[in-house]
Interface confidence: medium
């Protein structure tokens, strides 16, 4: 459960996150499992640990192996394992299956392709995108933040999409590429006024100060893959990106699912290290589509420690 597969290409940057999570204040120690040798934290090393992250700058085939991370708090230790494999660069265009991230599917109405793992890196826009090794050109393709949008998706748009970006570490630049398959579904469907399944209107969510909290905004929009549908969070009526609190982040990418034949989207809001002032904010789950907008408001309250222990 607490082991994670990670892979990369030689001479590219690879950053791996410890599968065990902890507060930012907790220390994380990394070891090379085969030798139990500690991974250094000094950034002058090609491979070094930086809190929850293990950085290969750049990676080498010899780095392949299992790495152990131990999250240490005053009261407990948690152990996780990162199974890292570094591959030689292919001379031809084919991207082998073992280098592919999860397949995403889209349709004529929904065509975002997210660049895998990019949130681990210190990168700046724009992303470069390639399909079957060819650079994407034309007005139908738009690189937006960490995803690619394809307007008017057609069956011919199916294929392997590679994002390429530059990771910057202390002034040094390292290339990173990641590839995933994109499949196209052709379907007709109905569009309904959005129905928010969670959270309930005016819900009070109990949280513990100092712990992490997740809020999920989930809504259904009709039958079939939906065009012009979005779910998002706002804080005190402001978009998360404009609010400017780095501890509170919206997950990049909306997860699409189907419930009783209805197309649903969800967006997770992650609050790290909950603070007292977070209890004063209004959290709005917004669901929008071409018919309009629905809004459910959530507020946070302090969880009673006695309830927690019982």
């Amino acid at each position: 459960k607490f082991s994670k597969q990670s892979w990369g290409l030689e001479n590219e940057a690879l950053i791996v996150r410890c599968p065990r999570q902890g507060k930012p204040s907790y220390t994380v120690d990394w070891y090379y499992s085969q030798t139990n040798k500690s991974i250094p934290t000094q950034e002058r090393n090609r491979v070094f640990a930086s809190g929850q992250l293990l950085k290969f700058l750049p990676a080498a085939v010899a780095d392949s192996g299992i790495y152990t991370c131990i999250v240490r708090s005053p009261t407990f230790n948690r152990t996780g394992y990162a199974n890292v494999t570094i591959y030689k660069k292919q001379s031809d265009c084919n991207v082998p299956d073992y280098l592919m991230y999860s397949t995403v599917s889209g349709s004529e109405k929904n065509s975002k392709i997210y660049c895998p793992t990019i949130d681990l890196y210190n990168w700046t826009a724009p992303l470069e995108w390639f399909k079957n090794c060819q650079a994407l050109q034309g007005s139908r393709y738009r690189a937006h933040k960490s995803f690619l949008v394809i307007d008017n998706v057609m069956t011919e748009d199916a294929g392997d999409y590679t994002c390429k970006f530059i990771h910057n570490e202390n002034g040094a630049n390292y290339s990173v590429t990641a590839t995933r398959s994109f499949t196209v579904k052709d379907e007709q469907g109905f569009s309904l006024f959005p129905v928010i399944g969670a959270p309930a209107q005016n819900e009070i969510k109990e949280v513990e100060i100092g712990k992490n909290a997740n809020l999920t905004c989930s809504a259904c929009f009709g039958k079939g893959t939906q065009f012009l549908a979005a779910v998002l969070w706002q804080l005190n009526g402001t978009k998360i990106t404009d609010f400017g609190e780095p501890r509170i982040q919206q997950e990049e990418g909306q997860n699409q699912s189907f419930s009783n034949g209805l197309a649903c989207l969800d967006m997770v809001l992650r609050i790290a290290d909950v603070k007292e002032e977070d209890l004063l904010l209004q959290y709005d789950c917004l669901a929008l589509n071409l018919h309009g907008l629905r809004r459910h408001t959530v507020r946070l309250s302090r969880k009673n420690p006695i309830d927690h222990h019982s």
Epitope: N110, V149, F190, S191, A229, L288, N289, H291
Partner: antibody
Framework: QVQLVQSGAEVKKPGSSVKVSCKAS????????IHWVRQAPGQGLEWMGG????????HYARKFQGRVTITADESTSTAYMELSSLRSEDTAVYYC???????????WGQGTTVTVSS | DIVMTQSPLSLPVTPGEPASISCRSS???????????LDWYLQKPGQSPQLLIY???TLQSGVPDRFSGSGSGTDFTLKISRVEAEDVGVYYC?????????FGQGTKLEIK
């Protein structure tokens, strides 16, 4: 009240492009979809495409694929429709319309006449 | 794409008399939630279209109650109980059940 005000009439040469604007007022711009519908002289209504300003995704009718681009500027509550490689048959009145909880096209702009002539 | 067929294409009516316009779709517009995704729009001479009826039978706010819509599945009707001079224009049905939205060819209502 809810209003959509479009830019003025345009006369264009074949092969050129036209960009029509649609400024919204009286509601929260990013909360509703914006669509573009055209009407050639003496003809019916034809949906060209639409977008939800907050989602960054636009979608177009196949007929206009590759020629039309719909964008939106949330800071000015303005939607734009750009049609390229104009030909004489693109001569029409172009309407922007707001989606809504009632009909698909709840509120309409006053229309922009685009004439394509050499 | 869904094809919407209206009839008649021209409708001369005497003021005070009723009028009826038919609209047929090539596929069902009825959703399992009971809604028919069909709108009716009126375009008066020299004006932009305006929404009259949505979901086949629901009158848009501000529209006179002499207008009514009915039908389900593939067959729909717009009725005007007593036509007034201000009702002249072209009436369009439009389906929003299947992507992309498509309009009927229009019915021109004129006063006799």
């Amino acid at each position: 009240q809810v209003q959509l005000v479009q830019s003025g009439a345009e006369v264009k040469k074949p092969g050129s492009s036209v960009k029509v604007s649609c400024k919204a007022s009286g509601y929260t711009f990013s909360d509703f979809s914006i669509h573009w519908v055209r009407q050639a002289p003496g003809q019916g209504l034809e949906w060209m495409g639409g977008m939800l300003p907050i989602s960054h995704i636009a979608h177009y009718a196949r007929k206009f694929q590759g020629r039309v681009t719909i964008t939106a500027d949330e800071s000015t509550s303005t939607a734009y429709m750009e049609l390229s490689s104009l030909r004489s048959e693109d001569t029409a009145v172009y309407y922007c319309a707001r989606g809504g909880s009632s009909g698909w096209f709840e509120v309409w702009g006053q229309g922009t006449t685009v004439t394509v002539s050499s | 794409d869904i094809v919407m067929t209206q009839s008649p294409l021209s409708l001369p009516v005497t003021p005070g008399e009723p009028a009826s316009i038919s609209c047929r779709s090539s596929q069902s517009l009825l959703h399992s939630n009971g809604y028919n995704y069909l709108d009716w729009y009126l375009q008066k001479p020299g004006q932009s279209p305006q929404l009259l009826i949505y979901a086949a039978s629901t009158l848009q706010s501000g529209v006179p109650d002499r207008f009514s819509g009915s039908g389900s599945g593939t067959d729909f009707t717009l009725k005007i109980s007593r036509v007034e001079a201000e009702d002249v224009g072209v009436y369009y049905c439009m389906q929003g059940a299947h992507w992309p939205p498509t309009f009927g060819q229009g019915t021109k209502l004129e006063i006799k």
